[in-house]
Interface confidence: medium
Amino acid sequence: WELTILHTNDVHSRLEQTSEDSSKCVNASRCMGGVARLFTKVQQIRRAEPNVLLLDAGDQYQGTIWFTVYKGAEVAHFMNALRYDAMALGNHEFDNGVEGLIEPLLKEAKFPILSANIKAKGPLASQISGLYLPYKVLPVGDEVVGIVGYTSKETPFLSNPGTNLVFEDEITALQPEVDKLKTLNVNKIIALGHSGFEMDKLIAQKVRGVDVVVGGHSNTFLYTGNPPSKEVPAGKYPFIVTSDDGRKVPVVQAYAFGKYLGYLKIEFDERGNVISSHGNPILLNSSIPEDPSIKADINKWRIKLDNYSTQELGKTIVYLDGSSQSCRFRECNMGNLICDAMINNNLRHADETFWNHVSMCILNGGGIRSPIDERNNGTITWENLAAVLPFGGTFDLVQLKGSTLKKAFEHSVHRYGQSTGEFLQVGGIHVVYDLSRKPGDRVVKLDVLCTKCRVPSYDPLKMDEVYKVILPNFLANGGDGFQMIKDELLRHDSGDQDINVVSTYISKMKVIYPAVEGRIKFS
């Protein structure tokens, strides 16, 4: 019996087609992805093959103005239109709190939404009961397939799930649910979830009875043969893990942003054992036409976005200096504003010993592309912010050793004075440079804001300590020459859309007046 699994993950609000790097589509003939194009390909496969499942491994939420405006209603609407068979909850599905998940998505979705390792307690338990499930048995042709869901247990540090959801260890939570499916005589089981490729592989190895793992969160690109675009494969598709009981378990992921449709064919024997698995992600490029009915629907929903982008988010009573003459040479108040917004977006009261789990932000000055003039009645719009942050990136959470941070700050000024983009803007950090010293030895003082304290204060950076830092995904990926961050990071979790982070902060503060306050000094 053959099953075709079509899968997406980490789509992050890319409902419209995008350019090759998943930013806003400029030249339509070279654009990719989007739900209209995805639907064309899905329908084509559904017509050609008998047993097809369309699955999503989480993080539909967050990433473009679509989510800012529609807050998840767009996800439910278009996933329903594409007739997804199941979805796993990702960490970003909690970005607007549990209410922001229940109302727009859980109550509106016509497909099961899954997670076996999220347990509700207190008053939320009855409110959310039945709206998401640990597993679902789906009829496919003459057979049944069990889908068990899972979500990163780090979600409380990455999003806003509140205090009435407990995120358990994935493997511990999955095993009893898989065992339950086995007792129901379901012998073909897919683990669908959002914990990253390393956890996907562990699930394949450890959870007895799981036949296939379809994952997300780490934006992992797998491919067999010559890859069709810029993404470099992390391994073959499917990635085969040998389980503890000696089975071959295929593990798949399909990069991110709806650029690819994962396509996996699995052959099962009569006892539900995987005999063979093969496939590859399908690049959704312009050779695949956009479905006209879905495209028309997208255009209808778009109208509200155009109106939103010119509405006032808040006011500034000071000039927001985002000029390259400032942000690439010294502390600039636009950099301070963005970093403050980045920290504010990551306020998660860990426990009584920590005021917050993260206190530091770094931001490449070259990523700040425009100032905002306060003399336009102080008005700040989404459109203004899109000029400041035009690249459609995310502000991510990483863990780095102090020694890596020190290298990053040395890199920040290693060729100072040439208006290069690597000059770092900061938050929760006080740095002093001596430019008379040779490159690689110019940081003379580097103090960081404590997290394990009730009154935040600045302490000298410790080389061997592990610190959490918020930074643009561009830096996490080694951009602007920050290779040491990419090579030495101990953990990387993708965060929220950059403009959304700043716009939310401005809306929350209502009136802003960021200053230059001595975060970056030269001795």
Partner: antibody, heavy 112, light 107 residues
Framework: QVQLVQSGAEVKKPGASVKVSCKAS????????INWVRQAPGQGLEWMGQ????????NYNRNFKGRATLTADKSTSTAYMELSSLRSEDTAVYFC?????WGQGTLVTVSS | DIQLTQSPSSLSASVGDRVTITCRAS??????LIWLQQKPGKAPKRLIY???SLDSGVPSRFSGSRSGTDYTLTISSLQPEDFATYYC?????????FGQGTKVEIK
């Protein structure tokens, strides 16, 4: 229950080849790796390679690559290990093993 | 290749003794480690997989644990049928490798 039953002892001359069989029962043969391990007299265990009967996929220990050939016949649920260019130091007990269960072993003696 | 170094190579113990065998991996193998028991003239028998999971039918006096890249097999109260050679085996990377064995003898 799972059983792996191997073929009988063999005596071979140096330079010859030997083919050991391993018949599986009690589980779905095509869905689990079969490993081959050898043990020289009084020595420890040495992994030779593995085969996945479902698709014929193999992984070899480089010490045996080129001399060992692993095959599997799904129709009879039997795995085979052929070792060529035998020398006296290949005298050993050869085991087939799943991840939990082992065959009884086959003694291969290489002597002129 | 991943090397597994077992210690001791042999030990003498009495019935009822608590016995500990250690296996050190040359690099990180997670918990992809098996413990096998082999009696003279017999095939090895798997006791523990995934560092600490007991195979069905294996007495609970056997247990496995890990600290970093050091793996331990413990027999809490040695029984007459436990006198044998014990091997660790990793299945984290190719080639699969074994420890050199620990022979448990009667004192």
């Amino acid at each position: 229950q799972v059983q792996l039953v191997q073929s009988g002892a063999e005596v071979k001359k140096p330079g010859a080849s030997v083919k050991v069989s391993c018949k599986a029962s009690g589980y779905v043969f095509s869905s689990y790796w079969i490993n081959w391990v050898r043990q020289a007299p009084g020595q420890g265990l040495e992994w030779m390679g593995q085969i996945y009967p479902g698709d014929g996929n193999t992984n070899y220990n480089r010490n045996f690559k080129g001399r060992a050939t692993l095959t599997a016949d799904k129709s009879t649920s039997t795995a085979y290990m052929e070792l060529s260019s035998l020398r006296s130091e290949d005298t050993a007990v050869y085991f087939c093993a799943g991840f939990a269960d082992w065959g009884q072993g086959t003694l291969v003696t290489v002597s002129s | 290749d991943i090397q597994l170094t077992q210690s001791p190579s042999s030990l003498s113990a009495s019935v009822g003794d608590r016995v500990t065998i250690t296996c050190r991996a040359s690099q990180d193998i997670g918990d992809s480690l098996i413990w096998l028991q082999q009696k003279p003239g017999k095939a090895p028998k798997r006791l523990i997989y995934a560092t600490s999971s007991l195979d069905s039918g294996v007495p609970s006096r056997f247990s496995g644990s890990r600290s970093g890249t050091d793996y331990t097999l413990t027999i809490s109260s040695l029984q007459p049928e436990d006198f044998a050679t014990y091997y660790c085996q990793q299945y984290s990377g190719y080639p699969l490798t074994f420890g050199q064995g620990t022979k448990v003898e009667i004192k």
